[in-house]
């Protein structure tokens, strides 16, 4: 008999839904130069509201008016463009709402220029056709706010063109970004107009601005990076998986178990078995067989595939997942029907992905 047995209750405590640390994109408010703009902070029960622009505290001045939950910008200029945030401070917590302001006129070579990155290969512009820098693929720049788990890699892009070909430099919080400003430095791929930081840490939080310039002009674009520290928790299994299945004798079936875990999870597929006609040992614990587990020799441990099933394969299949914090398990039943009976639920073969990191 296997040395492993399930002793804890298989019911899962309700937990917060799994997060992949994605933050919805901020709303964008567009204004033409000279226009006035009014934005309301969309946070409830805000006792005290503070405002920032590109991570820097925003106070009232002759063009910026802050009244309660409203921000007013009078006579907007392109310099007012950026990532704004209002933070509501309450007695027990605080909450931040982000939004973008884009002050641009119709002929500006700004963020809303059409994506022109359709050519198979880059073609140099005519040397006589002088042109100030412009964005070539604004689609790759739409996501301004990046909330990333610690230890992940982050890439910011500013694909641009111009003649002569512009140069690109990067600022962090408005100052020159130097390699020594972060452990491990960073990578810049000029041909891809990208900045890459590996293994991000909380001190990498801030605003990153690409400045693209040639002798005919300069454009810039700011990204905001938030580094989310991972909160260890036991594995979370997606509700409803694995799902009950039925198939005929000789058929194939798959059980899928979707796992959310920051810490490396170990996945096991277990089935109750009988030994000498008994389902339980002398100690009262059930006889269990580990059918599959994650490891070097096991690909796609989230999926248990059974081929050419027999009636003996019917029964309960348990997906048990553990990490160093704890464990979780959920089960499903397989019904094996005689050949002449059609199954209630047809087999679905999907290439299910592995556990979420």
């Amino acid at each position: 008999r296997p040395s492993f047995s399930l002793v804890e209750d298989t019911t899962l405590e309700p937990e917060e839904p799994p997060t992949k640390y994605q933050i919805s994109q901020p709303e964008v408010y567009v204004a033409a130069p000279g226009e006035s703009l009014e934005v309301r902070c969309l946070l409830k029960d805000a006792a005290v509201i503070s405002w920032t622009k590109d991570g820097v505290h925003l106070g009232p001045n002759n063009r910026t008016v802050l009244i309660g939950e409203y921000l007013q910008i009078k006579g907007a200029t392109p310099r007012d463009s950026g990532l704004y945030a209002c933070t509501a401070s309450r007695t027990v917590d605080s909450e931040t709402w982000y939004f973008m302001v884009n002050v641009t006129d119709a002929i500006s070579s700004g963020d809303d220029e059409d994506d022109t990155d359709g050519a198979e290969d880059f073609v140099s512009e005519n040397s006589n056709n002088k042109r100030a820098p412009y964005w070539t693929n604004t689609e790759k720049m739409e996501k301004r706010l990046h909330a990333v788990p610690a230890a992940n890699t982050v890439k910011f892009r500013c694909p641009a063109g111009g003649n002569p070909m512009p140069t690109m430099r990067w600022l962090k919080n408005g100052k020159e970004f130097k390699q020594e400003h972060r452990i491990g430095g960073y990578k810049v791929r000029n041909q891809h107009w990208s900045l890459i930081m590996e293994s991000v840490v909380p001190s990498d939080k801030g605003n990153y601005t690409c400045v693209v310039e040639n002798e005919y002009g300069s454009i810039n674009h700011t990204y905001h990076l938030d580094v989310v520290e991972r909160s260890p928790h036991r594995p979370i299994l997606q509700a409803g998986l694995p799902a009950n299945a039925s198939t005929v004798v000789g058929g194939d079936v798959e059980f899928v178990c979707k796992v959310y875990s920051d810490a490396q999870p170990h996945i096991q597929w277990i089935k109750h078995v009988e030994k000498n006609g008994s389902k339980y040992g002398p100690d009262g614990l059930p006889y269990l067989k580990v059918l599959k587990h994650s490891g070097i020799n096991s690909s796609n441990a989230e999926v248990l595939a059974l081929f050419n099933v027999t009636e003996a394969d019917a029964g309960e299949y348990i997906c048990k997942v553990s990490n160093y914090i704890g464990q979780a398990n959920q089960s499903a039943w397989l019904t094996v029907l005689p050949k002449q009976q059609a199954p209630g639920r047809e087999k679905e073969i999907t290439a299910s992905p592995d556990y979420l990191e």
Partner: antibody, heavy 119, light 107 residues
Framework: QVQLLESGGGLVQPGGSLRLSCAAS????????MSWVRQAPGKGLEWVSV????????HYADSVKGRFTISRDNSKNTLYLQMNSLRAEDTAVYYC????????????WGQGTLVTVSS | DIQMTQSPSSLSASVGDRVTITCRAS??????LNWYQQKPGKAPKLLIY???NLQSGVPSRFSGSGSGTDFTLTISSLQPEDFAVYYC?????????FGQGTKVEIK
């Protein structure tokens, strides 16, 4: 048309060195980043190293860092991979590949050259 | 480094079948994912770049989708010449890691 032709492979003893070359033609070599990708017998693809068109940027897979050096001579339209301190696990077919503009997708590949590290 | 996990590792299919291969990244890689086809003794061939763009000269039965961590390569109607090994590759991080490959065999 675009052509990439690798050379320099062969049998070498563990600890030895080898220099691979990749002759490029049919495109403006200096406009493109180039990579080396290898494939051990019966195994999958493993990216090895990349170099930007002007040589200003290079990067290596952890498995070869400190032992392999990528370089290019744009006047000769040639990419190089200097491999030192070779190990048995470096045995593979080595491909040179061109990166698409604005994307690190390898749109053209050479036919590959076999490197065998064995005593 | 970012890990790329392909599934299934192999599959058997018939000519005319719709085939789906998935690739999962260990972190968000935006749309920085490419798909390649490789036949025995040959160099790989680029099929799809940046998750969903069909490379010039590749038949339209090949398509790619996905962003973030989960990506899919679909062959809408498998042809005899499509039996090969398929690889995904991320280019979000400086080390352009490949998936372990999916072998598409004749049923």
């Amino acid at each position: 048309q675009v052509q990439l032709l690798e050379s320099g492979g062969g049998l070498v003893q563990p600890g030895g060195s080898l220099r691979l070359s990749c002759a490029a033609s049919g495109f403006t070599f200096s406009d493109y980043a180039m990579s080396w990708v290898r494939q051990a017998p019966g195994k999958g693809l493993e990216w090895v190293s990349v170099i930007e068109g002007d040589g200003s940027y290079t990067h290596y897979a952890d498995s070869v860092k400190g032992r392999f050096t990528i370089s290019r001579d744009n006047s000769k339209n040639t990419l190089y991979l200097q491999m030192n301190s070779l190990r048995a696990e470096d045995t593979a077919v080595y491909y040179c590949a061109r990166e698409k503009t604005y994307s690190s997708a390898f749109d053209y590949w050479g036919q590959g050259t076999l490197v065998t590290v064995s005593s | 480094d970012i890990q790329m996990t392909q599934s299934p590792s192999s599959l058997s299919a018939s000519v005319g079948d719709r085939v789906t291969i998935t690739c999962r990244a260990s972190q968000d890689i935006s749309s920085d994912l490419n798909w390649y086809q490789q036949k025995p003794g040959k160099a790989p061939k680029l099929l799809i770049y940046d998750a969903s763009n069909l490379q010039s000269g590749v038949p339209s039965r090949f398509s790619g989708s996905g962003s973030g961590t989960d990506f899919t390569l679909t062959i809408s109607s498998l042809q005899p010449e499509d039996f090969a090994v398929y690889y995904c590759q991320q280019h979000y991080s400086p080390s352009h890691t490949f998936g372990q490959g999916t072998k598409v065999e004749i049923k």
